[in-house]
């Protein structure tokens, strides 16, 4: 028998520095977690203790903090090289800055293979990107070899900016011939490493003949066997065992997100490459694990540029950006409109001639808007200003909801109106009218939404049984501020870009902004 240790991360999202327990900015260092310096300490410890170790990343290193905003992926290549990752799968967020923003900082600089079997380049891009990412890689480990096949969510064109010269194929259809080829070449230990979410990971384990282990990402799935060490609630045991169609037991793993845990899986293979046993658990990277001094010093060196960046002007406002709780928790506020407009703008993807865009709606809890921006400071808007407005380090995500769920959400928005509570919704691509004289749960009297399947966008009444795409903060997608109906009833949830980054990019693009209060949210006569 031959034993392999798989160390894995996924959805790190730019958390190069240690973070608080909820993966936001580290405040009290003695209680902070994760970060590449701490990760390196643990990885090195395991490499020294065990003979056959692979360090893998299942995608979405890009996007999430000011590190990515400033360094645009160069930081990912630099620190992943320093940690000596063995392979990485492409995630959807790796395309956030277009294909060029993937090729130049990451693909050309990475000293490890970057993989995806279901992304096919065409046209002029095919020769430019040739060999920079691969469908699979055969890695020597000790006296044996292991084949790693990559995959990426086929929803990427709706979630990011891969352009028109990359085709995202069905994962299972694309993986099978690559695995078959590896088998023909007598590579008999095969790991599928990819970024399509836990459901697809399980399907790959079930359907792709010859895959021995699946290491996934995208859905931020936390798996654990025994008592979990922090706040995350396990979605199942680690590893999660899937019985394949040909009767094999295939371990599937994921390691939550944000570099908080290091996935640790031990696999035992027989001489024919069959999995005999698998066991392990994610390792919580808490403050009991010291940060590696050399990596930490490097982080501090790279940090200097971030501090300079946060005071630079992104653009100007010629109007007061009203982000006060007195406005945003009671009525339409122009800061809410600005943020929602930025959220929609960030999700413009013309992937189908029938649609002007795939999504037109935005909702945003007023309680998430934490500060106004005064235009009387020469109109200057900096990252620092935006960090005061959006201090929680969240993301603006894409969900699919039924109209009936949206109606419930808007009822919840005003169910206890007047108490300055955070659930009051700011909107984009939505016209809502409330009648506060009616009883809670029956106060939405008009709800019109902007069409997407149209050449001239216009507002139509919400249909209860129709499925709509909506951009919203991850806080709401996860049921925050009492929006349990969103969490419970959403049909699909894809994590998006860092909130501040979305707004800063929009302001930089527009150069000068002047958002107005324009009647998106109204109260019917006699009640307000």
């Amino acid at each position: 028998a031959w034993e392999l240790t798989i160390l894995h991360t996924n959805d790190v999202h730019s958390r190069l520095e240690q973070t608080s327990e909820d993966s936001s900015k580290c405040v009290n260092a003695s209680r902070c977690m994760g970060g590449v310096a701490r990760l390196f300490t643990k990885v090195q410890q395991i490499r020294r203790a065990e003979p056959n170790v692979l360090l893998l990343d299942a995608g979405d290193q890009y996007q999430g903090t000011i590190w990515f905003t400033v360094y645009k992926g160069a930081e990912v290549a630099h620190f992943m090289n320093a940690l000596r990752y063995d392979a990485m799968a492409l995630g959807n967020h790796e395309f956030d800055n277009g294909v060029e923003g993937l090729i130049e900082p990451l693909l050309k600089e990475a000293k490890f293979p970057i993989l995806s079997a279901n992304i096919k380049a065409k046209g002029p891009l095919a020769s430019q990107i040739s060999g920079l990412y691969l469908p699979y890689k055969v890695l020597p480990v000790g006296d044996e070899v292991v084949g790693i096949v990559g995959y990426t969510s086929k929803e990427t064109p709706f979630l990011s900016n891969p352009g028109t010269n990359l085709v995202f194929e069905d994962e299972i259809t694309a993986l099978q011939p690559e695995v078959d080829k590896l088998k023909t070449l007598n590579v008999n230990k095969i790991i599928a490493l990819g970024h399509s979410g836990f459901e697809m990971d399980k399907l790959i384990a079930q359907k792709v003949r010859g895959v021995d282990v699946v290491v996934g990402g995208h859905s931020n799935t936390f798996l654990y066997t025994g008592n979990p060490p922090s706040k995350e609630v396990p979605a199942g045991k680690y590893p999660f065992i899937v019985t394949s169609d040909d009767g094999r037991k295939v371990p599937v793993v994921q390691a939550y997100a944000f570099g908080k845990y290091l996935g640790y899986l031990k696999i035992e293979f027989d001489e024919r490459g069959n999995v005999i046993s698998s066991h392990g658990n994610p390792i919580l990277l808490n403050s009991s694990i010291p940060e590696d001094p050399s990596i930490k010093a490097d982080i501090n060196k790279w940090r200097i540029k971030l501090d300079n960046y946060s005071t630079q002007e992104l653009g100007k406002t010629i109007v007061y950006l009203d982000g006060s709780s007195q406005s945003c928790r009671f009525r339409e506020c122009n800061m809410g409109n600005l943020i929602c407009d930025a959220m929609i703008n960030n999700n413009l993807r013309h992937t189908d001639e029938m649609f002007w865009n795939h999504v037109s709606m935005c909702i945003l809890n007023g309680g998430g808007i934490r500060s106004p921006i005064d235009e009387r400071n020469n109109g200057t808007i900096t990252w620092e200003n935006l960090a005061a407005v959006l201090p929680f380090g969240g993301t603006f995500d894409l969900v699919q909801l039924k109209g009936s769920t949206l109606k419930k959400a808007f009822e919840h928005s005003v169910h206890r109106y007047g108490q300055s509570t955070g659930e009051f919704l700011q909107v984009g691509g939505i016209h809502v009218v409330y009648d506060l004289s009616r009883k809670p749960g029956d106060r939405v009297v008009k709800l019109d939404v902007l069409c997407t399947k149209c050449r001239v966008p216009s507002y139509d009444p919400l249909k209860m049984d129709e499925v709509y795409k909506v951009i919203l903060p991850n806080f709401l997608a996860n049921g925050g501020d009492g929006f349990q109906m969103i969490k419970d009833e959403l049909l699909r949830h894809d994590s998006g870009d860092q909130d501040i980054n979305v707004v800063s990019t929009y302001i930089s693009k527009m150069k000068v902004i002047y958002p107005a209060v324009e009647g998106r949210i109204k109260f019917s006569t006699g009640s307000h």
Epitope: S130, G131, L134, P135, V138, P140, E144, V145, D180, K181, L182, K183, T184, L185, N186, V187, N188, E271, R272, G273
Partner: antibody, heavy 117, light 110 residues
Framework: EVQLLESGGGLVQPGGSLRLSCAAS????????YSWVRQAPGKGLEWVSA????????YYADSVKGRFTISRDNSKNTLYLQMNSLRAEDTAVYYC??????????WGRGTLVTVSS | QSVLTQPPSASGTPGQRVTISCSGS????????VNWYQQLPGTAPKLLIY???QRPSGVPDRFSGSKSGTSASLAISGLQSEDEADYYC???????????FGGGTKLTVL
């Protein structure tokens, strides 16, 4: 010790048939894929055919497709190459080779096939 | 005519370093691992390098391999008289669905 021993070579007339065998020892035969590679006198190496570990997948060079058949018998630890419709240009030393990991890692000593009238 | 192109001959004096190149295309070297074989006169080929740059046990570290894009190379440092042999590069070809060998390079130690 890993050993691959070819047999079945010899002189055959054009259009004739020959069956090559390769007996394996010193390792678990069924865990590997195999290939046949040939070398014409004074020339370079030319891949002929390959068979997967399970025997479910077979591959052939265009020059032999439709004339040669690769097969294996795991119970006998033996690899075969059935060669039909032989031509003068098939004259070569035929090597039985084990596929290691993404490579041909072990070779037999070879058996000479001469096609001549 | 092989699809993998090698120089037909190379030479060097004892102690010297020689490099043998192997040029292919996206469907073979571009997408697959390259192997190198040594064939001494009158013997079967022997694996020298696999997975582009890995040496099997028993192969001296004077032999090293590398790959970049659609080309690969074999370097032999500290050349010795017993290195005089034919050297072949080989890889799988995705289009042909089979193995490809280079035409071979005859190395002479002067």
């Amino acid at each position: 010790e890993v050993q691959l021993l070819e047999s079945g070579g010899g002189l055959v007339q054009p259009g004739g048939s020959l069956r090559l065998s390769c007996a394996a020892s010193g390792f678990t035969f069924s865990s590997y894929a195999y290939s046949w590679v040939r070398q014409a006198p004074g020339k370079g190496l030319e891949w002929v055919s390959a068979i997967s570990g399970s025997g479910g997948s077979t591959y052939y060079a265009d020059s032999v497709k439709g004339r040669f058949t690769i097969s294996r018998d795991n119970s006998k630890n033996t690899l075969y190459l059935q060669m039909n419709s032989l031509r003068a240009e098939d004259t070569a030393v035929y090597y039985c080779a084990r596929l290691g990991y993404s490579t041909i890692d072990k070779w037999g000593r070879g058996t000479l096939v001469t096609v001549s009238s | 005519q092989s699809v993998l192109t090698q120089p037909p001959s190379a030479s060097g004096t004892p102690g010297q370093r020689v490099t043998i190149s192997c040029s292919g295309s996206l469907s073979n070297i571009g997408r697959n691992e390259v192997n190198w074989y040594q064939q001494l006169p009158g013997t079967a080929p022997k694996l020298l390098i696999y997975l582009n740059n890995q040496r099997p046990s028993g192969v001296p570290d004077r032999f090293s391999g590398s790959k970049s894009g659609t080309s690969a190379s074999l370097a032999i440092s500290g050349l010795q008289s017993e290195d005089e042999a034919d050297y072949y590069c080989a890889t799988w070809d995705d289009s042909l669905k089979g193995w490809l060998f280079g035409g071979g390079t005859k190395l002479t130690v002067l």
